[in-house]
């Protein structure tokens, strides 16, 4: 009878055991375990009659189609063999033991005690045959195994091979190199690749195979397992298949496709193949003179650039518009796509403006091409050139004008100070009783006029002040401070200012150069009840041109014992001399009360303490504090009076020989103007020297003669 | 013509606020200063402070700087004076003046409680 | 601030005589630079606002009548109406222009 078995172990024995077992019996066991197992069978107890070659009693063991053993007896002879330690194996996991006694026994057998288990199958190591086993790796697990692929691969639908994803190349480059996957390792198995060379409209491509080519083929059939196919529009080439390369091909198209087919078996090292594109020629190419072409080259086709420049100094004209470079292209019908530009010699140009310069020309013809040369200078004697340099520009290869130190900035012209067209006369009479001023005598010389119309009827005032700078005119606080207030310094509204420069003559203001108010700055600390730092700024609104009748005065330095005792120093002014004429008089100079050309006086810088002394004496409250000195003579006679207020009084510095303004029209006592033992009070512009270039925005250094050093 | 028009009476409880308005015509209104000038029933003229308005410049009268606040629209040439916590004595005409030659109509303003 | 103190408080004058009103300042009110006296007058008749008649002390408005005169300098000015009008019942005011501002008492004139 059969026994069928399913279990993962058992345990086999032989009928009646451990007695002895019957005559004339067979028993089959079936053993079945799952696939991914074998049965492993070992014996613990064999005793078995002994025949010749296991003819009498026996145990089979044996598979679907095969014997793995016979045993019988009790112990190996050269014909009869017992299983002792010996396992059997089943190569699969089906298993068949057959037991068989004959019909007699002369002695007492007792039998066999076997055992089985199911074993794990290791395929990785056990499967041999390529048609079976993983392509790349393979893992094993108790009952079964699976595959896996190495990366950049995919598994195939067959569990077993490797395949890649290679249906999607593009190629539009000119020039490439397009190689089976892995090249020169083996190819993988089962893939469809797809290369598309994909080309503009014009050119041609040629495909080279290289030496080493390697596809799995056929003796008899042509390419029936892997192979590469070259579709060129619906003109398929190949297949190509085994060791020897193909022909190069002219595939006459701008657009190929190349496709290669690889089975699930073979280990072939694949191929590789440039490829070209080739187009229509273009003609020889010959520079433009004082140019050059890049690349060089004897032959040139289809889609290629040529880069024209021209030599240093020189630019690429075309179509009337200069460029740096040109670059034309071989078109596919094998023309050019433009014709040789020129090399036209770099322009400068001419020159820019130089604000109170002058620019002359040293190449003749007053050419302004590459390598010629301009001299920049500036207005002289009103205006100089900062830090002296050259002022030599040269036309640079980048079509610039170009100065060694400045580059290609312009130089700055920036006003002289102090030094007047016409030279001031040593001997002087007084301002009352008049002695006109020259013109040009004191071009800082500038008339401040107020009108406050922000009132019911207009306020207007006028005062006197200095040019400093372009912009810029210093005059005392107290001129252009709002007049309504008692004790509080408000400035006056920049709306309400007029500034006259150049003015000699105040019935004939054509000639003066009159100027709005930018800004009005007041000392932060002018004290309208001692008029201690009487001291202003306006800005004017727009720069004023110099010349003879319009030049600034120079700053002093910054000194706080300000100018020596008795030195002389002028004033000018186009002052009052009777006190009570009127503003509108003044300023319409309908009245003869009023100078109307321009006076000035030399007066002496008086010790301070003799003046501290002559002010502390009167009913009052007069205080000279040190930033203020007084002028004037003892006897009087000579004095500054209400109109000068706020105008420079001037000292010549003997070092630069240059006008200094060392002091402002401040105040002066209660008596008339030129009154005995009545000094003149000056602003002391030397303790304000840092605060004046502060508001004007500049460093001391910067105008040539802006403060005398 | 040049004028300056005022707004209309106010009556008020002490405590409270009051805004006169002042339009302007007939002239450039900001550039030149508005004055503010009140008179109580029976009494003189007391200057509350003015306004410039094209630059907001202000000046007060000390009694009135906690109490008074001038501003002014130059869009629409309006001068505006607001008083705030008023009490009974504040009860008075109040005068808008163009620096000093031309004056509105007044604008009387009670406070009662 | 600067007080102007006015005289007298009314005045009762016959139509076509003089008529003169005293102002006087606590602070000079000359300004050197502008060489004015910032002192003005003004006339407000009853139910009325306060008019122009006299600005830097001496110096008529415009359509104002050459009746009236202004004088004095620094601190003591003077309004002279030199022959009243019935229509110059009015009460009249000076007033300083340096800030603050402040105006005089006022003067009443009547007709006698």
């Known amino acids: 009878h059969t026994v069928e078995l399913n279990d993962m172990f058992g345990q086999i024995q032989s009928p009646g055991y451990p007695d002895s077992y019957p005559s004339d019996s067979e028993v089959t066991w079936n053993i079945t375990v799952p696939d991914g197992f074998r049965i492993k069978l070992y014996f613990m107890h064999f005793n078995l009659e002994s025949s010749y070659l296991c003819e009498y009693d026996y145990v089979k063991v044996e598979t679907e189609d095969q014997v793995l053993a016979t045993f019988c007896g009790r112990e190996t002879t050269d014909t009869e063999q017992t299983p002792g330690q010996e396992v059997v194996l089943s190569p699969g996991s089906f298993m068949s033991i057959t037991f068989r006694s004959d019909f007699s026994n002369e002695e007492r057998f007792t039998g066999f005690d076997a055992h089985y288990m199911a074993v794990d199958v290791d395929e990785c190591k056990e499967r041999e045959d390529e048609e079976l086993s993983c392509d790349h790796y393979c893992h094993n697990y108790i009952g079964g195994y699976y595959c896996s692929c190495r990366f950049g691969y995919i598994l195939h639908t067959d569990n077993r091979t490797c395949r890649v994803e290679c249906s999607d190349n593009l190629f539009t480059q000119r020039t490439g190199v397009i190689t089976s996957p892995d090249f020169p390792n083996p190819y993988p198995k089962s893939s469809e690749c797809l290369y598309t060379i994909e080309l503009e409209e014009g050119f041609m491509v040629n495909l080279q195979f290289e030496d080493i080519f390697d596809i799995e083929d056929h003796p008899e059939v042509p390419c029936p397992y892997d192979y590469i196919k070259i579709k060129v529009g619906p003109k398929v080439l190949g297949p190509f298949c085994g060791e020897k390369a193909p022909e190069p091909i002219n595939t006459q198209s701008h657009s190929v496709l190349i496709l290669f087919h690889s089975d699930n078996s073979g280990e072939n090292r694949g191929w590789r193949l440039s490829y070209r594109a080739a187009g229509n020629e273009c003609p020889e190419l010959q520079p433009p003179v004082h140019g050059k072409i890049e690349p060089s080259q004897a032959k040139y086709s289809f889609k290629d650039q040529v880069l024209i420049s021209c030599d240093t100094g020189y630019k690429v004209l075309k179509d009337n518009v200069e460029m740096d470079t040109f670059q034309i292209e071989c078109l596919k019908d094998g023309t050019w796509s433009n014709k040789i530009p020129t090399c036209k010699i770099v322009d400068c140009r001419a020159p820019g403006e130089l604000e109170h310069g002058l620019v002359t020309f040293s190449t003749r013809n007053n050419l302004t091409t590459y390598k010629s040369e301009i001299r920049y200078s500036c207005q002289e004697p009103y205006y100089k050139m900062l830090n002296n340099i050259t002022g030599i520009y040269t036309c640079s290869a980048q079509g610039v004008w170009m100065n060694k130190v400045l580059g290609r900035s312009l130089p700055t012209c920036l006003p002289e100070c102090g030094q007047p067209s016409r030279s001031l006369p040593s001997l002087v009479k007084r301002i009352i009783g008049g002695r006109n001023a020259e013109p040009g005598l004191f071009p800082w010389q500038a008339l401040i006029v107020v009108e406050d119309t922000s009132r019911v009827p207009n306020d207007k005032w006028f005062g006197s002040g200095a040019l400093l700078s372009e912009s810029w005119i210093l005059t005392a606080a107290h001129v252009l401070r709002s007049q309504r207030r008692d004790t509080t310094v408000i400035p006056v509204s920049k709306e309400h200012v007029t500034v006259y420069l150049g003015l000699h003559d105040v019935r004939d203001k054509s000639g003066a150069v009159n100027s709005s108010a930018a800004r009005v700055v007041l000392h932060p600390d002018f004290n309208i009840q001692n008029y201690n730092h009487d001291i202003a700024l306006v800005q004017l609104q727009e720069p004023v041109p110099l010349g003879p009748h319009v030049m600034p005065v120079c700053l002093p330095r910054l000194e706080p014992e300000g100018p020596s005792p008795h030195m002389l120093g002028l004033v000018a002014g186009w002052g009052i001399s009777n006190p009570n004429v009127t503003v509108d008089e003044i300023i319409s100079s309908g009245t003869r009360t009023l100078s109307d050309v321009l006076q000035y006086v030399k007066l002496p810088v008086v010790p301070h303490a003799e003046c501290k002394t002559s002010y502390e004496s009167r009913s009052g409250n007069y205080s000279v504090t040190e930033n203020m000195f007084c002028a004037g003579y003892y006897e009087g006679g000579k004095d500054t009076c209400l109109g000068d207020s706020g105008g420079a009084f001037v000292i010549l510095d003997d070092l630069s020989q240059r006008w200094v303004v060392q002091g402002l029209v401040s105040w002066g006592g209660p008596e008339e103007c030129g009154s005995k033992q009545v000094y003149g009070v000056y602003t002391k512009v030397s303790n304000y020297v840092d605060w004046v270039w502060e508001q004007m925005g500049s460093p001391q250094g910067r105008a040539p003669g802006g403060t005398v050093s | 013509q040049v004028q300056l028009v005022q707004s209309g009476a106010e009556v008020k409880k002490p405590g409270a606020s009051v805004k006169v308005s002042c339009k302007a015509s007939?002239?450039?209104?900001?550039?030149?200063?508005i004055e503010w000038v009140r008179q109580a029933p029976g009494q003189g003229l007391e200057w509350i402070g003015e306004?410039?308005?094209?630059?907001?410049?202000?000046d007060y009268n000390e009694r009135f700087k906690d109490r008074a606040t001038f501003t002014a629209d130059t869009s629409t040439s309006t001068a505006y004076m607001e008083l705030s916590s008023l009490r009974s004595e504040d009860t008075a005409v109040y005068y808008c003046?163009?620096?000093?030659?031309?004056w509105g109509q007044g604008t009387l303003v009670t406070v009662s409680s | 601030d600067i007080v102007l103190t006015q005289s007298p408080d009314s005045l009762a004058v016959s139509l076509g005589e003089r008529a003169t009103i005293n102002c006087k300042s606590s602070q000079n009110l000359f300004n050197s630079r502008t060489r004015k006296n910032y002192l003005a007058w003004f006339q407000q008749k009853p139910g009325q606002s306060p008019k122009l008649l006299i600005y830097?002390?001496?110096t008529r408005e415009s359509g104002v009548p050459d009746r009236f005169s202004g004088s004095g300098s620094g601190t003591d000015f003077t309004l002279t109406i030199s022959s009243l009008q019935a229509e110059d019942v009015a009460v009249y005011y000076c007033?300083?222009?340096?800030?603050?501002?402040?105006f005089g008492g006022g003067t009443k004139v009547e007709i006698k």
């Open positions: 003046v163009r620096s000093e030659d031309l």
């Open positions: 007939g002239y450039t209104f900001t550039g030149k200063w």
């Open positions: 830097w002390a001496s």
């Open positions: 306004i410039l308005p094209g630059s907001g410049s202000t």
């Open positions: 007033k300083q222009s340096y800030i603050p501002f402040t």
